[in-house]
């Protein structure tokens, strides 16, 4: 008995195609190892027709492809466009040869059965609708017409003219003339299910003189669309389901052994599971939507379906286009953390995937919102200014090659907490979903900025420090400008031992930035960071108002945004070892579609992108970089 | 509450036949993979076969080793109902016939991912 189990028996229809499942054991060597598939001969020998090393004959050329799920311990041979020919023994297996592990598969392709020559044939999908035409001699004008369908003794009644309708077809099926034309009448049967597939005719008249005509109805369920996709990807489901159904709800679907549960309509429900990582995008007026899940999980592979219906949820005998998805676990995008967690006052330093290769890919980050059907408002990018209620506090410093940018979050408040995307306009498997979580501060911040109540004068010299505790004291520290194109790091010269200290003095730790002297351009925000190499870890924020000099003028309280920096200077809390355990942003790289697959955000990013420089690591905040200096004690 | 319903088992003699009905009425049928399977006195549950359709004109059919060649699988979609045409049948084929349905299309052998189970029909093969 072969440990490798399918399908003894398929059998299909000339055209159709055919999607043939081969199980096989759960072993390392049996993941691995070449799957094929072949066709018995009378000699005994099977001759291989595809094998997942690549392999592809010339009669399968274009229309055959055969996938191996190690995670499911099953590989795939999906045929097309299937002839007559097709039919015959074959074998699914596993081995470099074709003598290893194998299983018999018989498969027959029939002709679509023969129908009566005058035989009209209808082919319609599951939920659409059918007229059937039924043409009439003039002589048979004032008689009774009808529609039947035939059972296996009789054909049974379905509507006549005479308003008698069957019950199982009441409310949608109509029989109806169009205009003046005394030598056709119609039938509309709506909603269409499985069950109303079948030969029908159509009669006007009784008796021999009687006009009847044969109808086939097909009615058929779409075929379901293989999508193969990479762990932590992303996928957009673009559902068409026609004009008819334009102003009905729309929803998305999964299979699960019973029902198919709803994991997105239009009518608000969304999935606990794919919280911060679904939309759904009405595209236009003639039913079109799409639904995009960025961050995909093994567990979210599966049977999808969309839909439209009043009440949001699958009903028979309506519109629906399905899709198979498969997760492939072996995924070009690297495994990062997925939550990231900050404290209130604090800072999170997100780390953002995109692929290498496109380096100058416009990077943005946008803050995922799940009211009505979910949108994702950009925030900041490299060509979008910084949103105004982020003023002071948001900025993306990309690093080009290194396949990631960062985007830097400080003076946490717990509001701030919810799911963030990583996107760029280059290749939207690389959209990543972040959640964002922030707690109440407990201890004392790692960076502190004093003096705090920071107003300098016009044409006077203004020093800022900013303490840091030894933890940091191997690590670059930084103080930059912030605008909204971003936080451009300010030139600076390292008068501090950077040597390894055998001890280390808490107190004098720090690090100062001085205006010399204070012009009116330097008003504004200022960062205080620290990073080693490119990864940037904890910052701290500091409004600097500006003011002339008056005489016996007091300092005069920097404005509200400021109020809000002591705050967070006086609360914000991180663990020990900078942000490499709770603090560093390391997304899950919960990749996306591309920026018309989802409008929010692609028509927002074109909202935002500014003509203006987008802030980089090594910008200049200003031309005359000699007024400041960093000095490290 | 959705229901399938078994019926057509009985008593018959080693080497005679049977065909089992499940009819599942308030089934979106079409979605289905639909599957039998049987359980003796003191034994567990085993699969026996399973009819997957993919709304058009392909059917892929199931079958266990013990029950290959012996037995055929068919389903009436217009009636919602499936089929399983037992031949040759031996004494050790007495059991509890079950129908079950699903909408996962994993492996079809497993129980558990069945959702849907009938009462079950008796069938006895005397020697």
């Known amino acids: 008995k072969s440990p490798i189990f399918g399908p003894q028996e398929v059998s299909s229809i000339e055209g159709d195609s055919v999607s043939i499942t081969c199980y096989y054991p759960d072993t390392s060597v049996n993941r691995h190892t070449r799957k094929y598939w072949c066709r018995q001969g009378a000699s005994g020998m099977c001759t291989t027709l595809i094998s997942s090393n690549g392999y592809l004959s010339k009669e399968y050329s274009g229309r055959a492809n055969l996938i191996n799920f190690p995670e499911n311990n099953t590989f795939v041979i999906n045929i097309e466009q299937l002839t007559q020919d097709d039919t015959g023994s074959y074998k699914c297996g596993l081995g470099t040869s074709n003598r290893g592990l194998s299983f018999d598969v018989s498969l027959e392709v029939s002709q679509v059965p023969e129908l009566p020559s005058d035989t009209h044939v209808y082919t319609k999908d599951i939920g659409r609708n059918v007229t059937i035409e039924c043409p009439f001699k003039r002589e048979n004008a004032p008689s009774k017409k009808s529609l039947c369908k035939k059972t296996n003794q009789s054909c049974e009644l379905v509507i006549d003219s005479t308003e008698k309708v069957n019950p199982s077809y009441i409310g949608r099926a109509k029989l109806f003339m169009k205009g003046t034309d005394l030598t056709v009448f119609y039938v509309n049967i709506s909603h269409l299910t499985h069950n109303d597939a079948g030969l029908y005719i159509c009669q006007a008249g009784e008796g021999p003189s009687a006009d009847k005509k044969n109808v086939d109805l097909q009615v058929l369920a779409p075929e379901p669309e293989l999508l193969y996709k990479d762990l932590r990807s992303s996928v957009t489901f673009e559902c068409d389901l026609g004009r008819e159904v334009a102003n009905e709800a729309k929803y998305l679907c999964r299979m699960n052994k019973e029902t198919c549960d709803v994991i997105i309509n239009t009518l608000g429900k969304r999935d606990p599971d794919f919280e911060g990582r679904i939309l759904i995008t009405p595209k236009d007026d003639n039913g079109r939507f799409s639904v995009l899940i960025t961050g995909l999980r093994k567990e979210d592979a599966g049977h999808y379906q969309c839909g439209a219906h009043s009440s949001g949820l699958p009903q028979e005998g309506w519109p629906i286009q399905t899709w198979q998805l498969f997760v492939n676990e072996e995924s070009t995008i690297p495994n990062r953390r997925s939550v990231v967690k900050g404290v209130t006052g604090g800072s999170v330093a997100i780390a953002c995937p995109y692929n290498p290769k496109e380096s100058s890919s416009l990077k943005y980050w946008c803050r995922w919102e799940g009211d009505g059907n979910g949108h994702c408002p950009v925030l900041v990018g490299t060509q979008a200014q910084v949103q105004e209620e982020y003023e002071g506090r948001l900025a993306l410093f990309d690093q080009p090659g290194n396949g990631t940018y960062t985007v830097i979050l400080n003076q946490l408040t717990t509001e701030d907490a919810g799911f963030y995307w990583c996107l760029t306009n280059g290749d939207s498997r690389w959209r990543t979903t972040i959640e964002l979580q922030v707690a109440e501060a407990t201890r004392e911040p790692n960076l502190e900025v004093t003096p705090q109540n920071a107003t300098a004068v016009l044409g006077e010299t203004f020093t800022v420090s900013c303490h840091y505790p030894c933890k940091f004291y191997s690590q670059e520290k930084y103080w930059c400008k912030w605008s909204n194109k971003g936080c451009h790091i300010l030139p600076s010269h390292d008068e501090g031992a950077r040597q390894s200290s055998v001890s280390c003095d808490q107190s004098s730790q720090l690090v100062s930035m001085t205006l010399n002297p204070v012009s009116k351009e330097d008003e504004g925000w200022y960062w205080c960071g620290v990073k080693q190499g490119q990864t940037y870890g904890e910052t701290t924020a500091i409004y600097i108002a500006v003011e002339e000099r008056t005489r016996g003028s007091s300092h005069v309280n920097p404005t509200d945004a400021n109020a809000r920096a002591k705050v967070a200077l006086e609360e914000e809390v991180v663990d020990s070892s900078i942000s490499e355990k709770e603090n560093k942003a390391i997304p899950n790289p919960g990749p996306f579609a591309n920026e018309r697959e989802i409008q929010n955000v692609g028509d927002q990013a074109q909202e935002n992108r500014a003509s203006g420089d987008a802030g980089s690591a090594d910008g200049q905040s200003r031309s005359s970089s000699s007024k400041h200096h960093h000095h490290h004690h | 509450e959705v229901q399938v319903v078994e019926s057509g088992g009985g008593l018959v003699q080693a080497g005679g036949s049977l065909k089992l009905a499940c009819a599942a009425p308030g089934l979106t049928f079409s979605s289905y993979r639909m599957g039998w399977f049987r359980q003796a006195p003191g034994q567990e549950r085993e699969f026996v076969a399973a009819?997957?359709?993919?709304?058009?004109?392909?059917?892929?059919?199931y079958y266990a080793d013990s029950v290959k060649g012996r037995s055929t699988i068919s389903r009436d979609n217009a009636k919602n109902t499936v089929y399983l045409q037992m031949n040759s049948l031996k004494p050790e084929d007495t059991a509890v016939y079950y129908c079950?349905?699903?909408?996962?299309?994993?492996?079809?052998?497993?129980?558990?991912?069945?959702?849907?189970w009938g009462q079950g029909t008796q069938v006895t093969v005397s020697s």
């Open positions: 009819i997957d359709w993919n709304g058009r004109g392909t059917y892929y059919r």
């Open positions: 079950a349905a699903t909408t996962v299309l994993t492996d079809p052998r497993v129980l558990n991912e069945y959702a849907t």
